[in-house]
């Protein structure tokens, strides 16, 4: 009876279990009753990082100098290239697809410490009573407006991203 499931590092095809190709190799032809799976090493600047049945290897990531990137770790047939930013620059994401001089703090966050040549911007959440409604690399959280000092009342509460809205006091006639 043909198998319905295969062991680890195998795959099911044409009612039989074939060996997967090891990392660094791609599939050329599936196994048959009489032959083993045929695999071929990935070419230069290509990789596959898992046991697989892929017919094409993946291209190594390109660290584009026009985006401020450089190679941190050269790729192998089993691993992708790892990019990093030129000195003094910072990755925009964990994948490091581009570089910025320093990151900015989003609305709801203020700048705790402005970036230097060696450290990126440090952001902090705006605490109760403070807000930031902009993305900035230098602005701190701003205190909510004090309606009382303007002889006004709070008409709309503030948040970490918005100031309070003040309005006139209701006068009793």
């Amino acid at each position: 009876e043909p198998p319905t499931a295969c062991r680890e590092k195998q795959y099911l095809i044409n009612s039989q279990c074939c060996s997967l190709c090891q990392p660094g190799q791609k599939l050329v032809s599936d196994c048959t009753e009489f032959t083993e799976t045929e695999c071929l090493p990935c070419g230069e600047s290509e990789f596959l990082d898992t046991w697989n049945r892929e017919t094409h290897c993946h291209q190594h990531k390109y660290c584009d100098p026009n985006l401020g990137l450089r190679v941190q770790q050269k790729g192998t047939s089993e691993t992708d290239t790892i990019c990093t930013c030129e000195e003094g620059w910072h990755c925009t994401s964990e994948a490091c697809e581009s570089c910025v001089l320093h990151r900015s703090c989003s609305p709801g966050f203020g700048v705790k410490q402005i970036a230097t040549g060696v450290s990126d911007t440090i952001c902090e959440p705006c605490p109760v009573g403070f807000f930031s409604n902009v993305s900035s690399a230098f602005e701190k959280c701003h205190p909510w407006t004090s309606c009382e000092t303007k002889d006004l009342v709070v008409q709309q509460a503030g948040t970490n991203k918005t100031d309070v809205v003040c309005g006139p006091q209701d006068r009793l006639r």
Partner: nanobody, 116 residues
């Protein structure tokens, strides 16, 4: 395409003044926080000054406080840096940059040399 074109640099004696300009195009200038950043020969990038989109709030590095003034004219899509009481240590290439400071959007800069 974002373009930032710095100008106004040159050779000036210590104690002298210069006004740098940065002409911006390819984006809505009035929506962006802008910075002046400089790089002295053989040194890293130093954040000099920043201004919010409306031009109402500013930041200055301690090294230039009281001597430099950042401003902007949103109707002309232009950023300025007025530099007074210049010192030898202000010698650098000055760049303007827009949030979020992508490497790909930097101009060529303008060279300021302070020397007697």
């Amino acid at each position: 395409e974002v373009q930032l074109l710095e100008s106004g640099g040159g050779l000036v004696q210590p104690g002298g003044s210069l006004r740098l300009s940065c002409a911006a195009s390819g984006f809505t200038f009035r929506d962006y926080e802008m910075w002046w950043v400089r790089q002295a020969p053989g040194k890293g990038l130093e954040r000099v000054s920043a201004i919010n989109p409306q031009g109402t709030r500013t930041y200055y590095a301690d090294s230039v406080k009281g001597r430099f003034t950042i401003s902007r004219d949103n109707s002309k899509n232009t950023l300025y840096l007025q530099m007074n009481s210049l010192r030898a240590e202000d010698t650098a290439v000055y760049y303007c940059a827009k949030l979020p400071f992508p490497f790909s959007e930097w101009g060529q800069g303008t060279l300021v040399t302070v020397s007697s």
